[in-house]
Interface confidence: low
């Protein structure tokens, strides 16, 4: 359709001349020269027109909104308020655009209709383990469509950061903070759907408790005191490791001291204390560590003690080490009594004593015990008599 010139399309320049006719009458002749400025073609004017596609979830049809300021005239398709309605997903439609500010040829706009909006879902792909400091957002295709996927582009804006990806990961964020991300999907560079998400990052890991002191002042006991971490937490876990054994306790968040009981004497304990919070997952704070060695205690009794006669007046005394030494050193003691009189008192590195030159035909009491350098153990007592001399 050719545009009709409007009164403002030409500027009139008039010059008036007067001549005498043969009849003698005066003829007034007016010469008018029209100057028309050149208009662009509509194809040129609307070369870079953009389109937004609006989706109707009920009808599952699109409306194409032409981003023009003028009320253009559409051919081939009906435009209402610069919108083309009832477009089917993934089908091409053609619309010609004209306006009285431009000349032929019209702009022929191919509407490459995008896939249905419900076929895309903005998905929070944040790993729960990392949800305290990261956000992940991802567009998912949840149904098939016939459009060319290569023509689909994605855009995210989170604060002042812009990403042209289907999936974004924001890292090194603050725990317990709200972040807003806007996203849109474009098909052939035409926006057809958008979504916004406000995501609050999860509770962060608690800080490390500060151990004030950690010590043992007895053989079976230890104590640890601490200051709690600054950040939110639910409880503490206290682990204590003895050699290869590990025991862990769950402690109330209000505790700042714990007394360890029933410890093994003269044993090094490695303690590790961390706070934790149960958020999207349980988050453990950094562990504070300390060590102590419990005090010595009396060793347990030697066992499997035997007394055997090696000759008329000699005895061989043996025993097995105590199950619990409970101290730094290793020494075995043997006391030999006749009646209430101590007749021998020997000390060896091993529990292997040869007692010679005893009285014949005498009842002896043999007491064997272990000494760990700090404490003696309970004696193992056996009675044995020497025989009459065979000679």
């Amino acid at each position: 359709q050719s545009p009709t010139p409007s009164p403002t399309d030409a500027y009139l320049n008039a010059s008036e001349t007067t001549t005498l006719s043969p009849s003698g009458s005066a003829v007034i002749s007016t010469t008018t020269i029209a100057t028309t400025p050149s208009k662009p073609t509509c194809d040129e004017k609307y070369a870079n027109i953009t389109v937004d596609y609006l989706y109707n979830k009920e009808t599952k049809l699109f409306t194409a909104k032409l981003n023009v300021n003028e009320n253009v005239e559409c051919g081939n398709n009906t435009c209402t308020n610069n919108e083309v309605h009832n477009l089917t997903e993934c089908k091409n439609a053609s619309v010609s655009i004209s306006h009285n500010s431009c000349t032929a040829p019209d702009k022929t706009l191919i509407l490459d209709v995008p896939p249905g909006v419900e076929k895309f879902q903005l998905h929070d792909c944040t790993q729960v383990e990392k949800a305290d400091t990261t956000i992940c957002l991802k567009w998912k295709n949840i149904e098939t469509f016939t459009c060319d996927t290569q023509n689909i582009t994605y855009r995210f804006q989170c604060g002042n950061m812009i990403f042209d990806n289907k999936e974004i990961k924001l890292e090194n964020l603050e725990p317990e903070h709200e972040y807003k991300c806007d996203s849109e999907i474009l098909y052939n560079n035409h926006k057809f759907t958008n979504a916004s998400k406000i995501i609050k990052t999860d509770f962060g890991s608690p800080g490390e408790p500060q151990i004030i002191f950690c010590r043992s002042e007895a053989a079976h006991q230890g104590v640890i005191t601490w200051n709690p971490p600054q950040r939110s937490f639910h409880n503490f876990t206290l682990c204590y490791i003895k050699e290869t054994e590990k025991d862990c306790l769950n402690l109330d968040k209000n505790l700042i001291k714990y007394d360890l009981q029933n410890l093994k004497p003269y044993t090094k304990y490695v303690l590790s204390l961390h706070a934790y919070i149960i958020a999207k997952v349980q988050r453990n704070g950094s562990a504070a560590m300390c060590h102590f060695t419990t005090k010595s205690a009396p060793p347990s009794q030697v066992w499997n003690m035997t007394v055997s006669m090696t000759s008329d007046n000699s005895m061989h005394v043996k025993c097995r080490p105590p199950r619990d030494r409970n101290g730094p050193h290793e020494r075995y003691h043997l006391e030999v009594e006749a009646g209430n009189t101590l007749v021998r008192n020997e000390s060896h590195k091993n529990c292997d004593f040869r007692v010679k030159d005893l009285q014949y035909s005498t009842d002896y009491t043999f007491k064997a015990y272990f000494h760990n350098g700090d404490y003696p153990g309970e004696p193992f007592i056996l009675h044995h008599s020497t025989s009459y001399n065979s000679k």
């Epitope: 590990k246 490695v270 560590m289 060590h291």
Partner: antibody, heavy 119, light 106 residues
Framework: EVQLVESGGDRVQPGRSLTLSCVTS????????MTWIRQVPGKGLEWVAS????????YYPDSVKGRFTISRDNAKNTLYLQMNSLRSEDTATYYC????????????WGQGTSVTVSS | DIQMTQSPPVLSASVGDRVTLSCKAS??????LDWYQQKHGEAPKLLIY???NLQTGIPSRFSGSGSGTDYTLTISSLQPEDVATYYC????????FGSGTKLEIK
């Protein structure tokens, strides 16, 4: 005789990964905590990672946390250090050591393996 | 994290001298401190564990003492073979080495 032999050191570019191994013999590996220590040539010792005998407790300094992973295979008597996102400041000789008193007193050390991170 | 400060960085002494090396922790480390000796081109060697316990096979001229935040390694009579760098190492709360003291013979 207690022996610790490190291997896996190499020259790598920044951002790349490397895994060090420490094969041990002459002692009951699964009774001991193990530690990785590193030393920049001409500089001091820096603790890198420690792991308990069962592997249930692991500790790292902030300088490697999130990038390095210590692990052990008690069946193979072997200690590992997986190093990701390597930086030039990770260039050092890496030693593995046995902690004689569970979490301290490193009484046996390997000979070290050299890691160079450079573009 | 706990910081360990060793002083002096370099120490020159004569054979037979009594030598004292210092190590200061930024907080109480409850005597959980070891001393290591490293000779040039060698792996470190454990000398003293838990402040004052002499490791098996280490000469008795080496001794350790201290508590709280202040610790000392003493060599009662310096020998030529003691030329090395000495490191303290805390294992009370995570782990930290000191920066080392280089011991030289005058």
């Amino acid at each position: 005789e207690v022996q610790l032999v490190e291997s896996g050191g190499d020259r790598v570019q920044p951002g790349r990964s490397l895994t060090l191994s420490c094969v041990t013999s002459g002692f009951t590996f699964n009774n001991y905590w193990m530690t990785w220590i590193r030393q920049v040539p001409g500089k001091g010792l820096e603790w890198v990672a420690s792991i308990s005998s069962s592997g249930g407790s692991i500790y790292y300094p902030d300088s490697v946390k999130g990038r390095f992973t210590i692990s052990r295979d008690n069946a193979k008597n072997t200690l590992y250090l997986q190093m990701n996102s390597l930086r030039s400041e990770d260039t050092a000789t890496y030693y593995c050591a046995r902690d004689e008193r569970w979490a301290g007193a490193m009484d046996a050390w390997g000979q070290g393996t050299s890691v160079t991170v450079s573009s | 994290d706990i910081q360990m400060t060793q002083s002096p960085p370099v120490l020159s002494a004569s054979v037979g001298d009594r030598v004292t090396l210092s190590c200061k922790a930024s907080q109480n480390i409850n005597k959980n401190l070891d001393w290591y000796q490293q000779k040039h081109g060698e792996a470190p060697k454990l000398l003293i564990y838990e402040t004052n316990n002499l490791q098996t096979g280490i000469p008795s001229r080496f001794s350790g003492s201290g508590s709280g935040t202040d610790y000392t390694l003493t060599i009662s009579s310096l020998q030529p073979e003691d030329v090395a760098t000495y490191y303290c190492y805390q294992h009370n709360s995570r782990f930290t080495f000191g920066s080392g003291t280089k011991l030289e013979i005058k």
